[in-house]
């Protein structure tokens, strides 16, 4: 941070030290030096001497004027030329900032990732403000009218343990900086409706050695309660389009899904489930890559190094896609 300096005078800014970008700005310098009747007063911005738009107002005071100031941040200081002194004498310094009032936060969403213990709310902050802007998330119980506030930057994690006022809430975010304040629209949430179930896991795959080779995918849904509706999507890695297989299940143990696939091909599998009566699907599971054997008579056997490396790499790349947008196709 900037070290404070002992001023031998005063420096001030009109309309203020923080102002709207594009405004005309005047920076004033008033010296109070002992044994000095300054020949000149000089202004420096970010360490560079200003050459233009400097006005000497009186013996002790000068002003520099900026038309349409558009620097997000600048450090100003002023000096005096004192007769008989070789160097300029420092008078005072000031940090100035320009920016914008905040936009009203938009597209607010709140979700509870299963087992996280938090309600995560995000929003669009709008155009950059360039100045320090605080966001306060307001959570109001529709049952008890109790209201809580959480300070944030561009998202917030609220412990579900702190949401003691029932299941229904109003949530909104307020953006505040030195130039203004805006509120988002209010979002009504029911805690049970915003749970994003944790993803299912595909644990392994095997292709049986038979006349018509059959691939079995082993997977487990983490949804514990009641009936579950699941989808498994799969495609050859060379293809763009997915095939989707649907399942109704109420099992919590490992599932087996059978597929009849082309030999000597690399396939990617993903699964997701939705509890009946629930709004939210799980995100797609991490991509699982399986290579089918060359012919019907050949038993699957992986060389120990190279293919595994490829699978890991593929999964990593896919994961980046699938987690950023659950509906987005992969590959």
């Amino acid at each position: 941070g900037i070290a404070t300096i002992n001023c031998s005078g005063n420096m001030w800014v009109e309309p203020g030290e923080i102002f709207q970008m594009g405004m005309n700005v005047s920076v004033y310098c008033q010296e109070a030096l002992k044994n000095c009747r300054p020949r000149n007063l000089h202004f420096y911005k970010n360490g560079f001497k200003e050459r233009f738009h400097i006005t000497r107002i009186n013996r002790t005071t000068a002003r520099v004027w900026y038309k349409g100031f558009s620097e997000p941040h600048a450090s100003m200081y002023c000096t005096a030329e004192c007769p008989g002194r070789f160097q300029e004498t420092l008078i005072c310094g000031k940090d100035i900032s320009s920016g914008y009032p905040p936009d009203a936060p938009s597209n607010m969403t709140c979700v509870i990732y299963e087992y996280s213990g938090n309600m995560t709310c995000t929003w669009n902050t709008g155009k950059p403000t360039y100045i320090d802007t605080k966001y306060t998330v307001h959570v109001k119980s529709l049952e008890t009218e109790e209201q809580q506030q959480y300070l944030a930057s561009n998202y917030v994690n609220i412990s579900t343990d702190s949401l003691q006022g029932g299941r229904k809430y109003l949530v909104w975010v307020q953006a505040v900086n030195a130039l203004g304040m805006e509120n988002s629209q209010q979002l009504q949430v029911h805690l049970d409706d915003i749970v994003i179930p944790s993803p299912s896991i595909i644990s392994r795959a095997e292709t049986t050695n038979a006349n018509v080779p059959k691939t079995i995918i082993y997977w487990k849904s983490k949804i514990m309660t009641g009936k579950v509706f699941c989808e498994m999507r799969y495609k050859a890695t060379t293809n763009q389009t997915w095939n989707v297989k649907e399942f109704d299940t109420n099992y919590t143990y490992v599932q087996q899904s059978e597929f009849y696939l082309e030999p000597n091909s690399k396939y990617v599998f993903q699964v997701r489930c939705q509890g009946t009566g629930k709004r939210n699907w799980q995100p797609w599971s991490s991509p699982f890559v399986h290579q089918t054997p060359q012919t019907a008579s050949q038993v699957t056997s992986k060389p120990p190094h190279e293919p595994q490396k490829i699978e890991m790499l593929t999964a990593t790349i896919f994961k980046g896609h699938s987690t950023s947008d659950n509906s987005q196709d992969i590959g």
């Epitope: 300096i5 911005k45 970010n46 360490g47 558009s70 941040h73 200081y77 300029e88 420092l90």
Partner: antibody
């Protein structure tokens, strides 16, 4: 963690042009003045360009004035150096550097990128 | 332009001993009661790293064995005790006025 990553270097013939980029992360880019500094094959360091936080003020040494243009895009957190009429003496490693003020009047290059190499040769 | 002259061009120091690098400016780099003199360390394949600013202030995370002194035109960087990791090039730089200028560097090696 403050990170500056330069790109765009390469080989150019004398009289040619090239644009360097520097992607900044880990700090509020728009609040800092920035510079480009180059290092010759003989390891000499030379400051070549300065830009203010909003891009309104730029300064250059005489050796590159009129040939180099520094600019920035605060929305993209990126600093640029457009170089034209290149000469063999411009051959160097080009670093982007963040300029921090420790007082209103004392500024220091406190973080540097890893650099990108420019070779000017016929 | 302010010319910065560094000496020696190279220096070999034993582990635990003191290394002293000097830098002379062609004119005073003092103003407002401080010296606009900075020191950088550069290891092979890496960018310069700020060690000392305003002649004697340590940069962030810089070990206490690095210290700077001087004013006006004459400055020095001291490293004591010398460690293996200190093998590098060292540059002085003035930030008093543009163009900001650097010394030619001192190569510090382990004896």
């Amino acid at each position: 963690e403050v990170k500056l990553v330069e790109s765009g270097g390469g080989s150019v013939k004398p009289g040619g042009s090239l644009k360097l980029s520097c992607a900044a992360s880990g700090f509020t880019f728009s609040r800092y003045t920035m510079s480009w500094v180059r290092q010759t094959p003989e390891k000499r360091l030379e400051w070549v360009a300065y830009i203010s936080t909003g891009g309104g003020d730029t300064y250059y040494p005489d050796s590159v004035k009129g040939r180099f243009t520094i600019s920035r895009d605060n929305a993209r957190n990126t600093l640029y150096l457009q170089m034209s009429s290149l000469r063999s003496e411009d051959t160097a490693m080009y670093y982007c550097a963040r300029r921090t003020s420790y007082s209103y009047y004392n500024y220091v290059f406190d973080y540097w990128g890893q650099g990108t190499t420019l070779t000017v040769s016929s | 332009d302010i010319v910065m002259t560094q000496s020696p061009a190279s220096l070999a120091v034993s582990l635990g001993q003191r290394a002293t690098i000097s830098c002379r400016a062609s004119e005073s780099v003092d103003n407002y009661g401080i010296s606009f003199m900075n020191w950088f360390q550069q290891k092979p394949g890496q960018p310069p790293k700020l060690l000392i600013y305003a002649a004697s202030n340590q940069g962030s995370g810089v070990p206490a064995r690095f210290s700077g002194s001087g004013s006006g035109t004459d400055f020095s960087l001291n490293i004591h005790p010398m460690e293996e990791d200190d093998t590098a090039m060292y540059f002085c730089q003035q930030s008093k006025e543009v163009p900001w200028t650097f010394g030619a560097g001192t190569k510090l090696e382990l004896k």
